[in-house]
């Protein structure tokens, strides 16, 4: 069938202290998030079809002012990458919250069946779980 | 026919003082904006085909420096949502101009025929009407 | 054939002093960048198929803190436009790095065979060449 794999996820929770990963959830019962092709494995998104994908993300910090992001010596950073299989581990997209409270970006990237994408939020600030402020998605665009 | 509904709009004007909505316009005579499927109803974008859409927006403040956004005024916020029918009213995408003068983001979301999207700019500041600084678009990506 | 033209590029280098253009490169040997349809002409992206395209970009400044971007009187600005043929020259997308170190955006725009896209970075700050921080791409979405 035509590879129209697509997913849009909402934030479920952050990981324990030593785990920078964000944990995602999706499905109509949760609101406007969905998985049609890709799947979730312990809150991480796994690709099921080879191809070029548009990956997009927006993350908003929960309790945030421009001073809260600028005051921190180690800026809060969001990185989206392939975290498994280990042989394909790579950072795909990286942004820092300098004096802002939201990052948003998108990129085209080749992904393969079995690639698991991780979204790592480094720093001490917590992300908002509001579904219009923090979301993560992929869209298959061509083989 | 294959649902390739797509639109890219440019800012026409802001609403009167108590109306936070931005009013959009589109069409080849105006430049590089267009509507192919969706339609405008009093400056608001109405969807004519069910499906999952990629919604994207960029808004730049007209007179802005980092001092004006951080020092001078209460946070200006942009929210994209379904504003009618009332039964489907929801915020899809929300961003604040903390220390910046531009917000830009995108997301995948299911939309239905008849959904009207509103872009609400709260705060006192005026958005730029330059077509390369402020624009709003949707693209049907799958059923 | 179905017009699935698509490209994702990584930064090769900046231009000489009087040339604000960024010079791009792409291909599997370089990492996750690729050109499938569009082509590069001296580091600038040339379109080979008419249609509506989703254009996206992210640029991160190499040595950057919020003070380095806010200190400059003339803010660093990124503009994506058609630079040739001259008869079609236009700015498509423009963003300033006010108190931030990264800009990212996307838009839908009609492009024609032979259009060459330029990405002009004005100001004195240098862009990062990290492939997860700075990238530029286009995706054909419909005729």
């Amino acid at each position: 069938s035509l590879g129209w794999d697509i997913a849009e996820l909402q934030l479920n929770h952050t990981g324990p202290q030593q785990d920078p990963r964000l944990y995602w959830q999706g499905g109509p019962a949760l609101g406007r998030s969905f998985l049609r092709g890709p799947e979730l494995d312990k809150g991480q998104l796994r690709i099921r079809r080879d191809g070029i994908y548009m990956v997009h993300i927006q993350v908003t910090l929960a309790i945030c002012s421009s001073t809260s992001t600028s005051r921190h010596h180690h800026p809060t950073t969001l990185a989206v990458g392939i975290c498994s299989p280990a042989s394909r581990s790579i950072s795909l997209l990286r942004l820092s919250f300098h004096q802002g409270c939201t990052i948003a970006s998108q990129r085209l990237t080749p992904l393969a069946r079995g690639d698991t994408l991780c979204t790592n939020l480094t720093g001490t600030l917590l992300p908002s779980r509001n579904t219009d402020e923090t979301f993560f998605g992929v869209q298959w665009v061509r083989p | 026919s294959l649902g390739w509904d797509i639109a890219e709009l440019q800012l026409n004007h802001t609403g009167p003082q108590q109306d936070p909505r931005l009013y959009w316009q589109g069409g080849p005579a105006l430049g590089r904006s267009f509507l192919r499927g969706p339609e405008l109803d009093k400056g608001q974008l109405r969807i004519r085909r069910d499906g999952i859409y990629m919604v994207h927006i960029q808004v730049t403040l007209a007179i802005c420096s980092s001092t004006s956004t951080s020092r001078h005024h209460h946070p200006t916020t942009l929210a994209v949502g379904i504003c009618s029918p009332a039964s489907r009213s929801i915020s899809l995408l929300r961003l604040s101009f903390h220390q910046g003068c531009t917000i830009a983001s995108q997301r995948l979301t299911p939309l239905a025929r008849g959904d009207t999207l509103c872009t609400n700019l709260t705060g006192t500041l005026l958005p730029s009407r330059n077509t390369d600084e402020t624009f709003f678009g949707v693209q049907w990506v799958r059923p | 054939s179905l017009g699935w033209d698509i490209a994702e590029l990584q930064l090769n280098h900046t231009g000489p002093q009087q040339d604000p253009r960024l010079y791009w490169q792409g291909g599997p040997a370089l990492g996750r960048s690729f050109l499938r349809g569009p082509e590069l002409d001296k580091g600038q992206l040339r379109i080979r198929r008419d249609g509506i395209y989703m254009v996206h970009i992210q640029v991160t400044l190499a040595i950057c803190s919020s003070t380095s971007t806010s200190r400059h009187h003339h803010p660093t600005t990124l503009a994506v436009g058609i630079c040739s043929p001259a008869s079609r020259s236009i700015s498509l997308l423009r963003l300033s790095f006010h108190q931030g170190c990264t800009i990212a955006s996307q838009r839908l725009t009609p492009l024609a065979r032979g259009d060459t896209l330029c990405t002009n970075l004005t100001g004195t700050l240098l862009p990062s060449r990290n492939t997860d921080e700075t990238f530029f791409g286009v995706q054909w979405v419909r005729p």
């Epitope: - | 007179i63 005024h73 209460h74 006192t124 005026l126 | -």
Partner: antibody
Framework: QLQVVESGGGLMQPGGSLRLSCAAS????????MSWVRQAPGKGLEWVSS????????YYADSVKSRFTISTDNAKNTLYLQMNSLKPDDTAVYYC????????????WGQGTQVTVSS | QAVLTQPPSLSASPGSSVRLTCTLN?????????ISWYQQKAGSPPRYLLY?????????GSGVPSRFSGSTDASANAGLLLISGLQPEDEADYYC?????????FGGGTKLTVLG
């Protein structure tokens, strides 16, 4: 340093026309907020009109709408106020006010130019 | 349309503190407008003093002494200009202005007299 200097005031008959000018210096004129504010003799300040960023927006007080036109010449860094169908109530000192990085404030003021409308 | 009301006059002694009020009509919330303050001395053009929205969102005009500060009183739907350590040169007319989306409106002004 933001500086603005008004000119063009004078004595006019009711129904007449007049064009005020405001020469600006010390800031990027085209991306700024420029306004006219007037003060009738012995009265308070009244906002008249504003023009924003590359002439993208123009706004007018109800009392002058359709009679006054605000405009700029970015090449000359000059703001104008074309006043038509003048009334005695328009008699005032007209101030030019500017803000280079925030539209909501009148940061820099000129000395004003006197407009008198009388028969 | 916003309407701003200021007391026409106020007098106080040198060294004292005064509070000038700028009340917005009930149809509009002070939180929806940017309130700024201007000083005008006899025979001179107005001078920008300050803008205030909150403690973290305010702006002092160039060369304006820190004796001048802003505040808001949400319950009274009013902007406030506070002047401490009043000095004879503070005698002037004080105007507030409210801004939203292109349009400005001024209050009627308060004439501040410094006694003695």
């Amino acid at each position: 340093q933001l500086q603005v200097v008004e000119s063009g005031g004078g004595l006019m008959q009711p129904g007449g026309s007049l064009r005020l000018s405001c020469a600006a210096s010390g800031f990027t004129f085209s991306g700024s907020a420029m306004s006219w504010v007037r003060q009738a003799p012995g009265k308070g300040l009244e906002w008249v009109s504003s023009i924003y960023s590359h002439s993208m927006y123009t706004y007018y007080a109800d009392s002058v709408k359709s009679r006054f036109t605000i405009s700029t010449d970015n090449a000359k860094n000059t703001l104008y106020l074309q006043m038509n169908s003048l009334k005695p109530d328009d008699t005032a000192v007209y101030y030019c006010a500017a803000s280079s990085d925030y539209e909501g404030l009148f940061v820099s003021w000129g000395q004003g130019t006197q407009v008198t409308v009388s028969s | 349309q916003a309407v701003l009301t200021q007391p026409p006059s106020l007098s106080a002694s040198p060294g004292s503190s005064v509070r000038l009020t700028c009340t917005l009509n009930s149809a509009n919330s002070v939180g929806s407008y940017d309130i700024s303050w201007y000083q005008q001395k006899a025979g001179s053009p107005p001078r920008y003093l300050l803008y205030y929205y909150s403690d973290s969102l305010s702006h002092q005009g160039s060369g304006v002494p820190s004796r001048f500060s802003g505040s808001t009183d949400a319950s009274a739907n009013a902007g406030l200009l506070l002047i401490s350590g009043l000095q004879p040169e503070d005698e002037a007319d004080y105007y507030c202005s409210a801004y939203n989306r292109g349009s400005h409106v001024f209050g009627g002004g308060t004439k501040l007299t410094v006694l003695g």
